[in-house]
């Protein structure tokens, strides 16, 4: 399955929208920095495409879930959020189309399941942090910065997969 070129463009648009969503000066939020433990090893180049597609799908699904909450809607600009949802939804569709075409529908490797679990735990840590920080503006900015970084890293994986073919 070849992810369409539009998927790559969509990823870039997603990052641009995340950048535009900023609401406050970040300089006041230094002390709110936090180690969320992004499972970078789960996005390493050692995976086959059949293994990476479901992990990337999980990553984008979790981002969608995170920014679809009531607390998120209160934190961000509604128009930008709607555009953001649209981009993520399109990327999920692209990845799901690959799964339907037969990529990764054979016997599920244990490694892939572990990777999906690691991504879920990562987002649980982010959700817990927001809760502990009472969904403060700075906490949301720290999370937005973290999602930009982790999404960018996972996007780079998609690009490396495409260039290997």
């Amino acid at each position: 399955c070849d992810l369409p070129q539009t998927h790559s463009l969509g990823s870039r648009r997603t990052l641009m929208l995340l950048a535009q969503m900023r609401r406050i000066s970040l300089f006041s939020c230094l002390k709110d920095r936090h180690d969320f433990g992004f499972p970078q090893e789960e996005f390493g180049n050692q995976f086959q495409k059949a293994e990476t597609i479901p992990v990337l799908h999980e990553m984008i699904q979790q981002i969608f879930n995170l920014f679809s909450t009531k607390d998120s809607s209160a934190a961000w600009d509604e128009t930008l959020l709607d555009k953001f949802y649209t981009e993520l939804y399109q990327q999920l569709n692209d990845l799901e189309a690959c799964v339907i075409q037969g990529v990764g529908v054979t016997e599920t490797p244990l490694m892939k399941e572990d990777s999906i679990l690691a991504v879920r735990k990562y987002f649980q840590r982010i959700t817990l942090y927001l809760k502990e920080k009472k969904y403060s503006p700075c906490a949301w900015e720290v999370v937005r910065a973290e999602i930009m970084r982790s999404f960018s890293l996972s996007t780079n994986l998609q690009e490396s997969l495409r260039s290997k073919e």
Epitope: A19, R22, L26
Partner: antibody
Amino acid sequence: EVQLVQSGAEVKKPGESLKISCKGSGYSFTSYWIGWVRQMPGKGLEWMGIIDPSDSDTAYSPSFQGQVTISADKSISTAYLQWSSLKASDTAMYYCARHPGLNWAPDFDYWGQGTLVTVSS
Amino acid sequence: DIQMTQSPSSLSASVGDRVTITCRASQSIDEFLNWYQQKPGKAPKLLIYFASSLQSGVPSRFSGSGSGTDFTLTISSLQPEDFATYYCQQAHSFPLTFGQGTKVEIK
């Protein structure tokens, strides 16, 4: 390879203006902030200020607020430090360094080689 | 502003010695503390970030500890290339501030 390359040494007279530069390469320039640090001859490090090149938001140390201006041109991955009217006390080595912003990553992990500014009549 | 106080301001030691430099913040900075090494005519080099994380490429003889207001940089066995000036820096809030430096000289 990540690099921050600063402009060359400058010799200026009191009252003159100056703009020194710091060009980033080998990484996404807008994903990191750029900070400026002063070191006067034989003295320690003093943080001057910082810029987020993605939107040019700046923060200054109270000691340097109004004395210098920090700017950036993201199209050429370059940050700047400028003076409108130099004083003899501005004689120092000036360093730029990159900062990961709100990400949990090493602060000021890469530094420029420094720009020596000498102000003398 | 958060004031950073380093001690000692200078020390003399021999190759192989265990060296400890302390840094105290005027208020709690959690673990937002960095350590840098600077040699004459060179830019500072990051050694330790977030109080205890060793920067990539830095020898394991360097270690950092502490949280809140009191921090320590330890060189377990001083090497000839370690003779330099060391600075702590708080990364908790702006304005960022450095300690005054500790010069490690050859005894």
